[in-house]
């Protein structure tokens, strides 16, 4: 015979337990029915009558089968920094979670008790660990060759764009600005390798830009600490290199010829020696043994034919650790120096060993007092590379970077009066350098 199904309330067999969705009432000593979710026990069972259940009132709930005398109160309304992801019903509690841009700083069994705004990484810093529902963003300084120009809790540092010719070098908080040529986010596949001594790591540069009256400084990010990308020189590298070489040779010859002619005409020559000196960069102790590499630009005065040179080289930044002071939530710690590098400097990618300087200057000097003789403008392009150990050179050593010789004495020997009239015939212009030396 099948076992008889017991209806609640019933007395359990000795040693047995009540069935699912039943509870044992100590007073009645009977197995009685539980109330379903959304209800509570209005009247407890007796030996003869089962539990009487009633629906939960507004703003109260029960989530499980139960025999509680009162429903549980729903949590308070969500605060302004939270969103209600689950409404309060008779069967479930209200759940508040942090709204976008915030994270849960103090959680409770379900949802969040206290939300805090995600830290925002300021310019020069990027997200190194994205925030989650329960953890804050971690900001880290942008590595050399990368930047972040936003105050954001989501933006990571991004690589600088690569220019044919750079107008403003990038730094940690600013992308490189290119001079009206199409930039790319990395190296061009075709590369012009300048005939310079090469180190073990090859450098990809962009094709030589057109000649220009303004001085230009090509800007490149040295490669990462990875093996050289051999063989990536484009097919047009050789012809372009040849053209550059021939042009430079031609200009040199023209200059020499002009100088000889002027000497023959018995104009009194004055060989001006102008030097733009760029000191060796000391290692940046604040960043370890070597600071971010700097790009020193030799810039001329507003006139493109000025002979007055000035070296614009910004100081190395000094960066302290970023999160070692207390800070208000939502704002990246400001322990670091604001800009990692000022206008004259640019970060290069990690692989560059030592500071690379690529200088292209066009100097027009030479004029006689009667304006009848001129010396052609020459483009002097010199590269300095303080190779892997800056300590080898004395800290204050001055490195001559550009010499213009062969100017002609006018009545006054100030740089301003050394500029001659350029009306009689156009001056041959120097070809700006194609890019940094392979490193």
């Amino acid at each position: 015979l099948p076992a008889q199904v017991a209806f609640t309330p019933y007395a359990p067999e000795p040693g047995s337990t009540c069935r699912l969705r039943e509870y044992y009432d100590q007073t009645a000593q009977m197995c009685c029915s539980k109330c379903s979710p959304g209800q509570h026990a209005k009247v407890f069972c007796t030996k003869t009558s089962d539990t009487v259940c009633d629906s939960c009132e507004d703003s109260t709930y029960t989530q499980l089968w139960n025999w509680v005398p009162e429903c549980l109160s729903c949590g308070s309304r969500c605060s302004s920094d939270q969103v209600e992801t689950q409404a309060c019903t008779r069967e479930q509690n209200r759940i508040c979670t942090c709204r976008p841009g915030w994270y849960c700083a103090l959680s409770k069994q379900e949802g969040c008790r206290l939300c805090a705004p995600l830290r925002k990484c300021r310019p020069g810093f990027g997200v190194a660990r994205p925030g989650t529902e329960t953890s804050d963003v971690v900001c880290k300084p942008c590595a050399p060759g990368t930047f972040s120009n936003t105050t954001s809790s989501t933006d990571i540092c991004r690589p600088h764009q690569i220019c044919n010719v750079v107008a403003i070098p990038g730094n940690a908080s600013m992308d490189a600005v290119c001079t009206s040529t199409s930039p790319t986010r990395s190296m061009a596949p075709g590369a012009v390798h300048l005939p310079q001594p090469v180190s073990t790591r090859s450098q990809h540069t962009q094709p030589t830009p057109e000649p220009s009256t303004a001085p230009s400084t090509s800007f490149l990010l040295p490669m990462g600490p990875s093996p050289p990308a051999e063989g990536s020189t484009g097919d047009f590298a050789l012809p372009v290199g040849l053209i550059v070489g021939v042009t430079a040779l031609g200009l040199l010859i023209i200059g020499v010829v002009n100088c000889v002619i002027m000497t023959q005409v018995k104009k009194k020559p004055l060989c001006l020696q102008r030097e733009a000196k760029v000191p060796h960069l000391p290692a940046d102790k604040a960043r370890g043994t070597q600071g971010p590499e700097q790009q020193h630009l030799l810039i001329t005065a507003p006139s493109s034919s000025s002979s007055s040179l000035e070296s614009s080289a910004s100081a190395l930044d000094r960066r302290a650790p970023t999160r070692n002071q207390p800070q208000a939530p939502g704002v990246e710690a400001s322990g670091a120096g604001e800009a990692r590098a000022s206008t004259g400097s640019s970060d290069s990618s990690p692989g560059g060993h030592g500071t690379q300087v690529n200088v292209t200057c066009i100097v027009n000097v030479c004029s006689s007092s009667d304006h009848s003789s001129q010396c052609s403008s020459q483009a002097s392009s010199t590269m300095g590379d303080t190779d892997s150990s800056p300590s080898e050179s004395p800290k204050d050593e001055q490195v001559p970077f550009s010499k213009e010789e062969c100017a002609f004495r006018s009545q006054l020997e100030t740089p301003e009066t050394l500029l001659g009239s350029t009306e009689e015939k156009p001056l041959p212009l120097g070809v700006p350098d194609a890019g940094m030396k392979p490193s």
Partner: antibody, heavy 118, light 110 residues
Framework: QVQLVQSGAEVKKPGASVKVSCKAS????????IHWVRQAPGKGLEWMGR????????EYAQKFQGRVTMTTDTSTDTAYMELSSLRSEDTAVYYC???????????WGQGTTVTVSS | EAVVTQSPATLSLSPGERATLSCRSS?????????ANWVQQKPGQAFRGLIG???DRAPGIPARFSGSGSGTDTTLTISSLQPEDFAVYYC?????????FGGGTKLEIK
Amino acid sequence: QVQLVQSGAEVKKPGASVKVSCKASGYTITDFYIHWVRQAPGKGLEWMGRVDPEDGNTEYAQKFQGRVTMTTDTSTDTAYMELSSLRSEDTAVYYCSTWDGFSYFDYWGQGTTVTVSS
Amino acid sequence: EAVVTQSPATLSLSPGERATLSCRSSTGPVTTNNYANWVQQKPGQAFRGLIGGTNDRAPGIPARFSGSGSGTDTTLTISSLQPEDFAVYYCALWYRNHWVFGGGTKLEIK
């Protein structure tokens, strides 16, 4: 010049622990996470975890939870990875790295070979 | 834990050809929140990060390398293979608080 120099090869018995060091130079160690990645013979890369040298916070791959400890000593610019309860399948080359998909600061140690054999 | 699957395991091509390497997440579509990365390994040489943030080339990486993400896959494309590009490539995806590497794709000369 940025460099990560790791300690030498280790031979360990099953059940033992190994502690690999990674000395950073050429940059401020607190500026970037240090990751630990391993490569078993003939196998691919396996990310073990990373440590933030600035505050010591760590994130570990689930597989290594409870068995790996990553620390840094900022006074010596050195990061450490300790793996306990070694088994033969932990035989691999262990790399420390500043590689991070967030930073592009891409440097790797030369690797430390750990051999677990009875 | 999420599993990242790379395909193909081996890819045989000739210099000058176009290579397409794929990376799939077991947890569904690869989103920008996965910050997909590609790393190159050559025998006896240091690893090199190529792509970060799904499609940004790392500084110094030639333009023939490009990354993209669509649907369940993230892809590394090498537009015209150079002899030095033959290596093993790993993708790595970020999952909330950890990186997961794929099994790797060996790119070999045909």
